[in-house]
């Protein structure tokens, strides 16, 4: 009897959908695996007789529930199938946006870039998929614990009237208000402001 794959799960970030599993202990030799997806009531092979413990399902439709399954194989024997259901648009993790930060005197000028999507044109980003897409920005004075959050209305934001010669850190994430779903924070970007722009009279 061949044991089934263990810990079968979908790892999906920005619609890069990777079905992952672990190989069970099996004394007779090395197992191979076959992973399939349900298409029009028929299961279709995606990865056949692979020695890997993952299979890329990024070409699935972003919409709807998909049934995926994987089994272990050895010689002419095979395990039972292990099934999972996956809805990309609901289940994919929203990866961190890109961010460009520029210091201008006592202001930080930020531009945000929505995450790109696997298997899509360069210009078709997560913002195109989710109509309610917005950004959350948090910033803080480097070395302090107090964080401030803002929700920019556009793909850019300016933090004005900051303390001069002070290092501020900024990070951004995608947020979907209609789903109350937040993405992953970007790595903090820390920049030092320069002088106060006001001219003494």
């Amino acid at each position: 009897m061949v044991p089934p794959p263990e810990n079968v799960r979908m790892n999906s970030v920005n619609f890069k959908n990777i079905l992952q599993w672990e190989s069970p202990a099996f004394a007779k030799g090395n197992l191979t695996f076959t992973a399939q997806y349900l298409s029009y009531r028929i299961f279709q092979d995606k990865c056949m007789n692979t020695t890997l413990t993952e299979c890329d399902f990024s070409s699935l439709s972003k919409y709807g529930d998909h049934t995926l399954r994987v089994r272990a194989e050895f010689a002419d024997e095979h395990s039972d199938w292990v099934n999972i259901t996956f809805c990309p648009v609901d289940d994919t993790i929203i990866g961190p946006p890109g961010m460009q930060v520029e210091v201008l005197a006592d202001s930080l000028h930020m531009r945000f870039l929505a995450p790109k999507i696997e298997n899509e044109y360069e210009t078709w980003t997560m913002k195109n998929v989710y109509n309610s897409w917005t950004y959350n920005v948090q910033y803080w004075k480097n070395g302090t614990d107090e964080k401030f959050q803002i929700t920019p209305q556009y793909d850019f934001e300016v933090l004005r009237n900051l303390e001069p010669w002070t290092t501020y850190c900024v990070q951004v994430r995608g947020f979907l208000p209609d789903r109350n779903k937040a993405g992953e924070w970007s790595e903090p970007v820390c920049e030092q402001t320069t002088h106060d722009e006001t001219v003494p009279s």
């Epitope: 070409s59 439709s61 972003k62 919409y63 648009v89 899509e120 044109y121 078709w124 998929v129 109509n131």
Partner: nanobody, 124 residues
Framework: EVQLVESGGGLVQPGGSLRLSCAAS????????IGWFRQAPGKGLEGVSC????????HYADAVKGRFTISRDNSKNTLYLQMNSLRAEDTAVYYC?????????????????WGQGTQVTVSS
């Protein structure tokens, strides 16, 4: 059942132009995303371009960027693909497709309705 009908294909010399059209028989082309795909001889289906209804944004495959232009005329319920500076490698059957959910642009899995295709041959 929605039927998409492409037209405008033909034989053209390298460097020439063609304009493909796609109409929905008896229906409007009022879909969140509509796009063009192509299939070259012996190759798989390849995304060419799409247009999003929500913001009228247009998106292109790298291979056609700057040469092809997608547009839609809502009054005529027609989708167009203007193809300029055509090359031999653009030879393919071109398909129009429409998506009900509009979540994707390039992947054929994200489209629900398809036309029968129109042949484009670029040759001297």
């Amino acid at each position: 059942e929605v039927q998409l009908v492409e037209s405008g294909g033909g034989l053209v010399q390298p460097g020439g132009s063609l304009r493909l059209s796609c109409a929905a028989s008896g229906n409007s082309l009022d879909y969140p995303t509509i796009g063009w795909f192509r299939q070259a001889p012996g190759k798989g289906l390849e995304g060419v371009s799409c247009i999003s209804a929500s913001d009228a944004s247009t998106h292109y495959a790298d291979a056609v960027k700057g040469r092809f232009t997608i547009s839609r005329d809502n009054s005529k319920n027609t989708l167009y693909l203007q193809m300029n500076s055509l090359r031999a490698e653009d030879t393919a059957v071109y398909y129009c497709a429409a998506s009900l959910h509009g979540l994707g642009c390039k992947s054929e899995a994200d489209y629900d309705y398809w036309g029968q295709g129109t042949q484009v041959t670029v040759s001297s």
